[in-house]
């Protein structure tokens, strides 16, 4: 029998080892053992949580996130005449979601096939880099959008080229920052072959030396710098925004804006509660437990939290809906299988028949689309 090496490895959650002994499978075939995981990690890697629940959630995210963010990006780039800062941030948000979601078919196949990665090391690194990159990009662009929304209420000045240029500059800086902070994820070997389970994992099993200190320090830094600080800014912007809206005079138009602002705040809050807070909190707790105890009892929660973090790609379109008039129109018409051009023509014909602009609405047999907002 061939002796395995004595290097050590560790499961993403707990202790895995490189066996220095020969390994005989249940079928009696002796093979060289390279990486090994403990019973808990093995049960997770072969269990329904990772092979059924995760692919179901990722399929939902892919089916909802790809078309909605694709449409959003198309609307923001080609169907929005004035490129306000909000539009620029939302376009970047949609792009970040798309860059993450396009890889989901590979992720779904990986989990369905028992956490077995067959697409090579480079694709695994791209998938993981984009996975985390999307989460932190979403947080930062959401922060920019939130601060910008507040700024618009405080400073309701017209659109200026300068503001758009600042927004583009900030967006480029965010992409550069995310690229830099995710470099470690691209550099680290993410694929590990586990002979005992006959699978090659992608990110689910990582070397012990890396896990014990480095991963904890890495995700703690990200949680503080790219989650807590932006979360504080976002929360501040919305608290101040609510104060401003409360104190402002209320006509019908202001009331609609206020309602949309509240819906936006609720959506962003939901995103933080469902997607960003659990994942960032559990990333830190999980790696802290590995560092301090050599094992993580919150592994299942950690997996679920990371999985739920991808739902931001489904929640983001609601943000676009509450912020962008153009996206709202396209979304409504896409859902009603109508082209915007048809609706615009009907609006024109309705107004030409001297219908009041305030109450102008287009009634179809199925629903009514208000066009006066």
């Amino acid at each position: 029998t061939i002796q395995g090496t004595n290097r050590s490895s560790k499961g993403r959650s707990l202790i895995g080892k490189v066996d220095g002994t020969s390994h005989v499978t249940g079928k009696g075939v002796t093979v060289e053992t390279v990486f090994s995981v403990d019973e808990f990690s093995a049960s997770v890697l072969t269990g329904k949580l990772t092979t059924v629940f995760l692919p179901i959630v990722y399929t939902i995210v892919f089916v909802v996130g790809l078309p909605s963010n694709g449409m959003a990006l198309w609307v923001f780039l080609f169907r929005t005449k004035k490129k306000h800062p909000a539009v620029i941030y939302m376009a970047n948000l949609a792009l970040a979601d798309l860059l993450s979601v396009i890889w989901f078919p590979l992720k779904i196949a990986y989990h369905i096939h028992g956490n077995n990665w067959i697409y090579g090391e480079a694709l695994c690194n791209v998938l993981i880099g984009f996975f985390y990159g999307n989460m932190y990009c979403s947080i930062l662009f959401m922060t920019c959008l939130s601060v910008q929304r507040y700024w618009v209420i405080v400073n309701p000045m017209g659109h200026s080229r300068k503001k758009a240029n600042i927004a583009i500059g900030i967006s480029l800086a965010i992409w550069l920052l995310i690229l830099l902070v995710t470099i470690p994820l691209y550099v680290v070997k993410q694929t590990i072959f586990i002979p005992a389970l006959n699978i090659t994992t992608c990110h689910d099993v990582l070397p012990e030396q890396l896990l014990v200190g480095d991963m904890f320090n890495y995700f703690l830094s990200l949680a503080i710098g790219v989650f807590l600080f932006p979360a504080f800014l976002t929360a501040s912007a919305y608290v101040l925004m609510i104060r401003m809206l409360r104190s402002s005079a209320m006509d019908e138009n202001s009331e609609k804006k206020r309602k949309r602002a509240i819906k936006l705040i609720v959506t962003v809050l939901a995103m933080y509660l469902i997607c960003f807070t659990p994942s960032n909190l559990l990333l830190v707790v999980h790696y802290f437990l590995i560092k301090s105890q050599g094992q993580s009892h919150v592994y299942a929660l950690y997996i679920v939290a990371l999985c739920l973090s991808t739902l931001n790609s489904c929640i983001d379109p609601f943000v676009y809906y509450f912020v962008s008039h153009d996206f709202r129109d396209h979304a409504k018409n896409a859902l009603l299988c109508r082209s915007v051009r048809t609706v615009k023509q009907m609006q024109v014909s309705l107004t030409s028949k001297k219908h009041s602009r305030k109450s102008s609405s287009y009634s179809s047999s199925s629903t009514t689309v208000k066009t006066s907002y």
């Epitope: 290097r7 002994t21 499978t25 403990d38 019973e39 005992a196 030396q209 050599g294 094992q295 993580s296």
Partner: antibody
Framework: EVQLVESGGGLVQPKGSLKLSCAAS????????MHWVRQAPGKGLEWVAR??????????YYADSVKDRFTISRDDSQNMLYLQMNNLKTEDTAMYYC????????????WGQGTTLTVSS | DIVMTQSHKFMSTSLGDRVSITCKAS??????VAWHQQKPGQSPKVLIY???NRHTGVPDRFTGSGSGTDFTLTISNVQSEDLADYFC?????????FGSGTKLEIK
């Protein structure tokens, strides 16, 4: 309460065979990896063999000193662990302990009280 | 295989004293070290895992420390029931290996 009770030890002649048993109770036996560890009289502890759970296809591991002579097996329905020892040598004389591996891979967490094997002519 | 060396075969102490038992690994094992206590005529029991974490029910006078290659088990306020053999063990890689043991005695 976790309990591991070994049995089957005794006096055997060199080149003889013997099967040790370990009855497990107080935990979900089929989800844990199990080990045999031995301790020669007045000596230190030596790992002998390991068997994984069904999840990992009952994979088995052996120390070089017992490879091809000892076979570790388990019966999950009976909560039993076994060590079949063939072609015994005098240096196999020791106290044999049945040990549970921590579910999270953190070394061993429970030891049995041991059973004595004496190999002598 | 990784060799675990416990340089002191015996250590003498007085009741109520503090004693430190050391263990050295032949190569880096990270924090994957456990300490086992074996009282005369009994089977071993786990005291410490992952270098510094006490196993369930282990009194807090037992503390483990170290990482890499050097590890220490410290018993503060030694009690009569602590008189036993203490073995370190690495589980960084297979085969798991043990130190030769340190016998704690009363002066």
């Amino acid at each position: 309460e976790v309990q591991l009770v070994e049995s089957g030890g005794g006096l055997v002649q060199p080149k003889g065979s013997l099967k040790l048993s370990c009855a497990a109770s107080g935990f979900t036996f089929n989800t844990y990896a199990m080990h045999w560890v031995r301790q020669a009289p007045g000596k230190g502890l030596e790992w002998v063999a390991r068997i994984r759970s069904k999840n990992v296809h009952y994979a088995t591991y052996y120390a070089d000193s017992v490879k091809d002579r000892f076979t570790i097996s388990r019966d999950d329905s009976q909560n039993m662990l076994y060590l079949q020892m063939n072609n015994l040598k005098t240096e196999d004389t020791a106290m044999y302990y049945c040990v549970r591996e921590d579910y999270y891979g953190s070394s061993y967490d429970y030891w049995g009280q041991g059973t004595t094997l004496t190999v002598s002519s | 295989d990784i060799v675990m060396t416990q340089s002191h075969k015996f250590m003498s102490t007085s009741l109520g004293d503090r004693v430190s038992i050391t263990c050295k690994a032949s190569q880096d094992v990270g924090s994957a070290v456990a300490w086992h206590q074996q009282k005369p005529g009994q089977s071993p029991k786990v005291l410490i895992y992952w270098a510094s974490n006490r196993h369930t029910g282990v009194p807090d006078r037992f503390t483990g420390s170290g990482s890499g290659t050097d590890f220490t088990l410290t018993i503060s306020n030694v009690q009569s029931e602590d008189l036993a053999d203490y073995f370190c063990q690495q589980y960084s890689s297979y085969p798991f290996t043990f130190g030769s043991g340190t016998k704690l005695e009363i002066k």
